[in-house]
C-alpha cells in the first residue's frame, strides 16, 4: 500500500434553513481529515469540527451571532495515516466556501397553519411563529422577530369542493378572509421575502381543510 | 517569534481560590484556540479544555467542568486558568498550547501549583 | 471519552535497537498525535496525523497505524532519544492522552 496525496476538499455548499446552517463538501476522506475555519470579512478565522472524517460542519452557532454579517469559510484537508500532504512547505491544503450572508441566503423552512378559526363568514388563520437558532438576550427568536416586515405569508384558499384559488397576504402571522357560510375550505401558505433575489419562497405549508381538528368554528 | 509565558509556581492551602495565566506574543492571539493541559506529579498529560480568544467560547473536558474556568482577556493576550477552591488533587503542571496544526507547536513552559494545608 | 492505552509503560533499551511503542483506542480513532516529553521540559509534539514526522524529527522514528491500534518506531535507538512518549486522539471530544511510555537507555 503506497502513499497517496492529501486531496483538496471542493463542492463546499452552504445549506441553510431557518438559520440551521451547515456546510457541506467533497470527497469522502481516505487517510486525511479535515478542519473547517468560518470568518467573517473583518474577523479571525475561528476552527471549528476539529480534525473530522465526516464532510458536513454545522456551523449555526457561528453565523447566528450576526446573521446580516456575510461568512466565508475554508476546508482544510490534512494528512491522517500513510499520505503526502501536497501543500507547499508543509502548510495544509485547504478550499474556500462560497460567501453566505444568512439575513439573504437561508432558506425558508416550510411554514405550517396552526389553527383556523370561523366565525360566521370570516376565517381567521394563523401561522406558526417558527423558532429559529438565532438568540438575543439568551433567548431563541422567531422567523419573524428576525425578519420583521421583510417577510410575509401568502395565503392559498380554495373551497373543498372546487379547485379555484383565491390569495391573500400578511406582513404579520395572521389572515382574516372572507368565506361563503356553509362552505367548506382547505388553506394552505407560503412563508416570502419579497425583498430577495434568491430564496425568496419557502414551499407550501401542508394542506389544512375545515371540517379538521385544527378549525374552531362559531356561528 | 511565537512565544508563550505561563505566571510562576503558586503554593496554595486547599479551600484557596487562584488564577494562572499565559501570555501569548509574536502572533495574532485572538485567531487560535488555547488549550491547558494538566500533569500530576510523576504522571501522564491530561486535556483540560481550550478556549477561543477572540469570543470566549470554551470547550471543556467534562472531567473539569465544576472545577476549573477558561477566560481571557484579549487586550493584554492572556488566558487564565482559575479554580475557586483548590484540592490537593489540583497539585500539578499546568501547560498553556496553542491549537495547532501539524509542526506548529507552542507550549508555555508551565505552571507549577502545589495544594498543601 | 477515548481511552488511550499505551504499552509498555516503560522500555530500557541498548542504544542502536528497535524501539516499538503501541496505542490502543477504546474506539475507532482518525487523527493520532504523538508527543516527546523531557524531565523538567514541556511536550514537545513529534509525530502527527498519525505518520508525519514533525519538524527537526529525525527520520529513525516513524509512526503508524489505524482505527483502534497505533505504533511509534525508533528504529535504532540513540541516547537523545531517553524520553516519555504520549499519544494523542483529537477525533473526539475529549482529547485524551495516553498514559506515557518512558524509554530509558541501557
Known amino acids: 500500500s503506497g502513499t497517496t496525496n492529501t486531496v483538496a476538499a471542493y463542492n463546499l455548499t452552504w445549506k441553510s434553513t431557518n438559520f440551521k446552517t451547515i456546510l457541506e463538501w467533497e470527497p469522502k476522506p481516505v487517510n486525511q481529515v479535515y478542519t473547517v475555519q468560518i470568518s467573517t470579512k473583518s474577523g479571525d478565522w475561528k476552527s471549528k469540527c476539529f480534525y473530522t472524517t465526516d464532510t458536513e460542519c454545522d456551523l449555526t452557532d457561528e453565523i447566528v451571532k450576526d446573521v446580516k454579517q456575510t461568512y466565508l469559510a475554508r476546508v482544510f484537508s490534512y494528512p491522517a495515516g500513510n499520505v503526502e500532504s501536497t501543500g507547499s512547505a508543509g502548510e495544509p491544503l485547504y478550499e474556500n466556501s462560497p460567501e453566505f450572508t444568512p439575513y439573504l441566503e437561508t432558506n425558508l423552512g416550510q411554514p405550517t397553519i396552526q389553527s383556523f378559526e370561523q366565525v360566521g363568514t370570516k376565517v381567521n388563520v394563523t401561522v406558526e411563529d417558527e423558532r429559529t437558532l438565532v438568540r438575543r438576550n439568551n433567548t431563541f427568536l422567531s422567523l419573524r422577530d428576525v425578519f420583521g416586515k421583510d417577510l410575509i405569508y401568502t395565503l392559498y384558499y380554495w373551497k373543498s369542493s372546487s379547485s379555484g384559488k383565491k390569495t391573500a397576504k400578511t406582513n404579520t402571522n395572521e389572515f382574516l378572509i372572507d368565506v361563503d357560510k356553509g362552505e367548506n375550505y382547505c388553506f394552505s401558505v407560503q412563508a416570502v421575502i419579497p425583498s430577495r433575489t434568491v430564496n425568496r419562497k419557502s414551499t407550501d405549508s401542508p394542506v389544512e381543510c375545515m371540517g379538521q381538528e385544527k378549525g374552531e368554528f362559531r356561528e | 517569534e511565537v512565544q508563550l509565558v505561563q505566571s510562576g509556581a503558586e503554593v496554595k492551602k486547599p479551600g484557596e481560590s487562584l488564577k494562572i495565566s499565559c501570555k501569548g506574543s509574536?502572533?495574532?492571539?485572538?485567531?487560535?484556540?488555547m488549550n491547558w493541559v494538566k500533569q500530576m506529579p510523576g504522571k501522564g498529560l491530561e486535556w483540560m479544555g481550550m478556549?477561543?480568544?477572540?469570543?470566549?467560547?470554551?470547550r471543556l473536558n467534562q472531567k473539569f467542568k465544576d472545577k476549573a474556568t477558561l477566560s481571557v482577556d484579549k487586550s493584554i493576550s492572556t488566558a487564565y486558568l482559575q479554580w475557586s477552591s483548590l484540592k490537593a488533587s489540583d497539585t500539578a503542571m499546568y501547560y498553556c498550547?496553542?491549537?495547532?496544526?501539524?509542526?506548529?507547536?507552542?507550549w508555555g513552559q508551565g505552571t507549577t501549583v502545589t495544594v498543601s494545608s | 471519552e477515548i481511552v488511550l492505552t499505551q504499552s509498555p509503560d516503560f522500555q530500557s533499551v541498548t542504544p542502536k535497537e528497535k524501539v516499538t511503542i503501541t496505542c490502543s483506542a477504546s474506539?475507532?480513532?482518525?487523527?493520532m498525535n504523538w508527543y516527546q516529553q523531557k524531565p523538567d521540559q514541556s511536550p514537545k509534539i513529534w509525530i502527527y496525523?498519525?505518520?508525519n514526522l514533525a519538524s527537526g524529527v529525525p527520520s529513525r522514528f516513524s509512526g503508524s497505524g489505524s482505527g483502534t491500534d497505533f505504533t511509534l518506531t525508533i528504529n535504532s535507538l540513540e541516547a537523545e532519544d531517553a524520553a516519555t512518549y504520549y499519544c494523542?486522539?483529537?477525533?473526539?471530544?475529549?482529547?485524551?492522552f495516553g498514559g506515557g511510555t518512558k524509554v530509558e537507555i541501557k
Open positions: 498550547a496553542r491549537e495547532d496544526y501539524g509542526s506548529s507547536d507552542y
Open positions: 509574536g502572533y495574532s492571539f485572538t485567531s487560535y484556540w
Open positions: 478556549i477561543y480568544p477572540a469570543d470566549s467560547e470554551t
Open positions: 474506539s475507532s480513532v482518525s487523527y
Open positions: 496525523g498519525i505518520s
Open positions: 494523542q486522539q483529537k477525533s473526539s471530544f475529549p482529547w485524551t
